[in-house]
Interface confidence: medium
């Protein structure tokens, strides 16, 4: 074979967002018949020559960027895309509220606001069932996520996390769930308001295939991202390369 071997995939199961003291498994997947895997934590000297790393209890020190590669004969593969393992529950949960309220008429506007304390200048807003979070571009201790022209599809359970751009892999606990109810529509919402919100441990299904991809710079546009946009779109003039999250392999 000419050229380097194709890169493997690296996944965190059940999620790359891991509550402190909870288990997570990092799995490197290459083609059949691999001679040797190497899984490493970047910016550290930690590595192991195995395809699977089981972490029985997540610690702050284990949060960070990981990648893997494999060897066949004397050839090494290209490295996998980086997987960024985030420890959650490190800091107090932010508060999540809806303005003017959590019940909104179809076609109306609502703003979800996540608020925390000084020094936590980054936010991620998750809607259960969506494959990626929404990011607020502006660094501040509260973040606004406007939803313009609400539809039934916006109904559901939302949570937000806060973290510091100084320690981007150490996140807060999730906010209490906020149930957004869209009235005046016959379409079934994605989650019934009477149904109890799922516990944090089960919430990971929405993020099971996320690879967190941070940069040191936040989006420079001051306009908050409307969460009617597709999660795969970039709201940055620099394009998708500066998105914070990309779908895992």
């Amino acid at each position: 074979q000419s050229g380097p071997l194709p890169k493997p995939s690296l996944q965190a199961l059940p999620s790359s967002l891991v509550p402190l003291e909870k288990p997570v498994t990092l799995r490197c997947q290459g083609p059949p018949g691999v001679d040797l895997y190497r899984l490493e934590k970047l910016s550290s000297s930690r590595y192991q020559d195995q395809a699977v790393l089981f972490i029985p209890a997540m610690k702050r020190s284990l949060a960070g960027r990981y990648r893997c590669s494999y060897q066949n004969g004397s050839l090494w593969s290209l490295p996998s895309d980086q997987l960024e393992l985030v420890a959650t529950g490190v800091f107090a949960k932010p508060s999540l509220s809806a303005q003017p309220g959590p019940a909104v008429s179809s076609g109306g506007d609502v703003t979800l606001q996540c608020q925390t304390r000084y020094g936590f200048d980054q936010f991620a807003l998750y809607k259960e069932g969506d494959p990626a979070p929404y990011k607020n571009p502006e660094r501040w201790y509260r973040a606004s996520f406007p939803i313009i022209t609400v539809t039934a599809a916006h109904s559901g359970t939302y949570r937000c996390y806060s973290f510091s751009s100084r320690d981007p892999y150490l996140w807060s606990a999730p906010s209490d769930p906020l149930e957004l109810v869209v009235t005046g529509t016959s379409v079934t919402p994605s989650r019934l308001p009477t149904e109890p919100p799922s516990p944090v441990a089960e919430f990971s299904e929405a993020t099971a295939e996320l690879t967190v991809s941070f940069t040191n710079e936040v989006f420079t546009t001051e306009t908050s991202r409307s969460i009617t946009a597709s999660p795969k779109e970039s709201d940055s003039p620099a394009g998708p390369a500066r998105q914070y999250y990309t779908k895992g392999n």
Partner: antibody
């Protein structure tokens, strides 16, 4: 990282003044910024904060309604407009990059309020 | 407002010895087990310089002779061993509660 303050001077009580802070060496538009002052007695006091894009501002009660923080990200410049100045506002004024704590500070510019 | 009281106000230490500076908060600055207390060094004619953030996280480029510890209301900055270059005033600052406040400073001198 470099932060360079300017605009300080001698002002009479009740007067106004605008301070500037020119930033370089980092992506200015990505960071919340603050003004912190140091009195002649060497006490430090946080004065104002503005979010990275300029949408949000925050002040302690001691300057609220009298001071206005703003920024021009195209010019990489932070401002502090001060009015209704009092002798208690006499201080060295520093601009600083803000994480809740302040990881980079300018050299400061001096404001003296005196009749 | 949270009041931060530093002690002593001034401190004279022999070269090579240990310097210990205390900062006491009028109420807890902890949240979720994290202490929102920070330390700065200010040399004459210079702006403050960040030493530690969140009580014990050493800022990049600061020598390991400096250590930060404490939780809730009681925090300590330790320099061991003290060197000539450490002559400065040291300040603590909290960011757990608005408004953010600073301690009154501790002036370190060489004996």
């Amino acid at each position: 990282v470099m932060l360079v303050e300017s605009g300080g001077g001698l002002v009479k009580p009740g007067g106004s003044l605008k301070l500037s802070c020119a930033a370089s060496g980092f992506t200015f538009s990505s960071y919340a910024m603050s003004w912190v002052r140091q009195t002649p007695e060497k006490r430090l006091e946080w004065v104002a904060t503005i979010s990275s894009g300029g949408s949000y501002t925050y002040y302690p009660d001691s300057v609220k309604g009298r001071f206005t923080i703003s920024r021009d990200n195209a010019k990489n410049t932070l401002y502090l407009q001060m009015s209704s100045l009092r002798s208690a506002d006499t201080a060295m004024y520093y601009c600083a990059r803000d994480y809740g704590y302040f990881d980079y500070w300018g050299q400061g510019t001096t404001l003296t309020v005196s009749s | 407002d949270i009041v931060l009281t530093q002690s002593p106000a001034s401190l004279a230490v022999s070269l090579g010895q240990r310097a210990t500076i205390s900062c006491r908060a009028s109420e807890s600055v902890d949240n979720y087990g994290i202490s929102f207390m920070h330390w700065y060094q200010q040399k004459p004619g210079q702006p403050p310089k960040l030493l530690f953030y969140r009580a014990s996280n050493l800022e990049s480029g600061i020598p390991a002779r400096f250590s930060g510890s404490g939780s809730r209301t009681d925090f300590t900055l330790t320099i061991n061993p003290v060197e000539t270059d450490d002559v400065a005033t040291y300040y603590c600052q909290q960011s757990n509660t608005d408004p953010r406040t600073f301690g009154g400073g501790t002036k370190l001198e060489i004996k």
